[in-house]
Interface confidence: low
């Protein structure tokens, strides 16, 4: 498997990595034990079934999900298209008359610049 | 190279909050963790949570859980630990740290932010 | 949670001579994933901490050779083959694998 880079890394990809510090023998991912939290589901447990990838993903080296497009996370657990604002991809600015919007996971969140040209 | 540049020193009355800022360069902000870390007088140094910035997603001690939170900007790639209703004993220097993916060490330090919580 | 004891808490060391820091956590951190997240970090006096040692015996880049460390379980170990000035400070063991993360104590070591 070479190096993939995406817009987002995220724990379910082989990240890319920008420096080379880190020897690469183990997948990109960081499970974690806790022992007084039970598995709430899969975003919320903090330790996961290492061979379960979701939405297609197959597991890979014992503990590491290469997820089909459009899919990310850990687990494959995230859909990029439904965290797209319509045309505006995810984690996206989109500049307005008066205000900042940035689309987050699904959400159009727009903050006002009273200080351009023309807003009160 | 890589460097977390923390935000400077805070004096705080009890019951107030506190937003200690850690700014980060030279590598991919998305792709490692933020950890936090503080470390009082004297003392030794104690884990308070971490935070993924490629997602929001968090892990914390639970000893801090109600009064903590960990945010990030990924825009200015700076990473933020909000701390409320202070009490003397969190006068404290706190670190921020880089968390690679691939291990769960903290291989880059920020260089403290003495907060010190006094009436 | 996951109480990390360290030993000595003080450590005076003769330059040259070797060194050795214990570690032992309350119960075992070995993930569930098989790998064992314990780390060794220094902190030099009136520095931020710097990372020595991962997942338990691998060195750190730039981390010199003479700094080991060993163990599985619950009972770890730092050795210093030979000490030299440049490595005074407080040593701390750390768990990674189970939240929350724990450190312990600290071990200081000092030039006799």
């Known amino acids: 498997l070479g190096h993939q880079e995406f817009a987002r890394p995220s724990r379910g990809y082989l990240a890319f990595r920008d420096d080379s510090i880190w020897p690469q023998e183990e997948p990109a991912i960081r499970p974690r034990s806790s022992q007084r939290v039970p598995p709430m589901g899969i975003q919320h447990s903090k330790e996961l079934n290492r061979t379960c990838c979701l939405n297609g993903g197959t597991c890979m080296l014992g503990s590491f999900c290469a997820c089909p497009p459009s899919f990310y996370g850990r687990n494959c657990e995230h859909d990029v298209r439904k965290e797209n604002c319509g045309s505006v991809p995810h984690d996206t600015w989109l500049p307005k008359k008066c205000s900042l919007c940035k689309c987050w996971h699904g959400q159009l969140r727009c903050f006002p610049q009273a200080f351009l040209p023309g807003c009160d | 190279q890589v460097q977390l540049v923390e935000s400077g020193a805070e004096v705080k009355k009890p019951g107030a909050s506190v937003k200690v800022s850690c700014k980060a360069s030279g590598y991919t902000f998305t792709s490692y963790w933020i950890h936090w870390v503080r470390q009082a007088p004297g003392q030794g140094l104690e884990w308070i949570g971490e935070?993924?910035?490629?997602?929001?997603?968090?892990n914390y001690n639970e000893k801090f859980k109600n009064r903590v939170t960990l945010t990030v900007d990924t825009s200015i790639s700076t990473a933020y630990m909000h701390l409320s209703s202070l009490r003397s004993d969190d006068t404290a220097v706190y670190y921020c740290?880089?968390?690679?993916?691939?291990?769960?060490?903290?291989?880059?330090w920020g260089q403290g932010t003495m907060v010190t919580v006094s009436s | 949670d996951f109480v990390m004891t360290q030993s000595p808490l003080s450590l005076p060391v003769t330059p040259g001579e070797p060194a050795s820091i214990s570690c032992r956590s309350s119960?075992?951190?070995?993930?569930?994933?098989?790998?064992?997240?314990l780390e060794w970090y220094l902190q030099k006096p009136g520095q931020s901490p710097q990372l020595l040692i991962y997942?338990?015996?691998n060195r750190f880049s730039g981390v010199p050779d003479r700094f080991s460390g060993s163990g599985s379980g619950t009972d770890f170990t730092l050795k210093i083959s030979r000490v030299e000035a440049e490595d005074v400070g407080v040593y701390y063991c750390?768990?990674?694998?189970?939240?929350?993360?724990?450190f312990g104590q600290g071990t200081k070591l000092e030039i006799k």
């Open positions: 935070n993924d910035p490629s997602n929001g997603r968090t």
């Open positions: 119960q075992s951190i070995v993930h569930s994933n098989g790998n064992t997240y």
């Open positions: 997942k338990v015996s």
């Open positions: 750390f768990q990674g694998s189970h939240v929350p993360l724990t």
């Open positions: 740290a880089r968390g690679p993916n691939y291990f769960y060490s903290m291989d880059y």
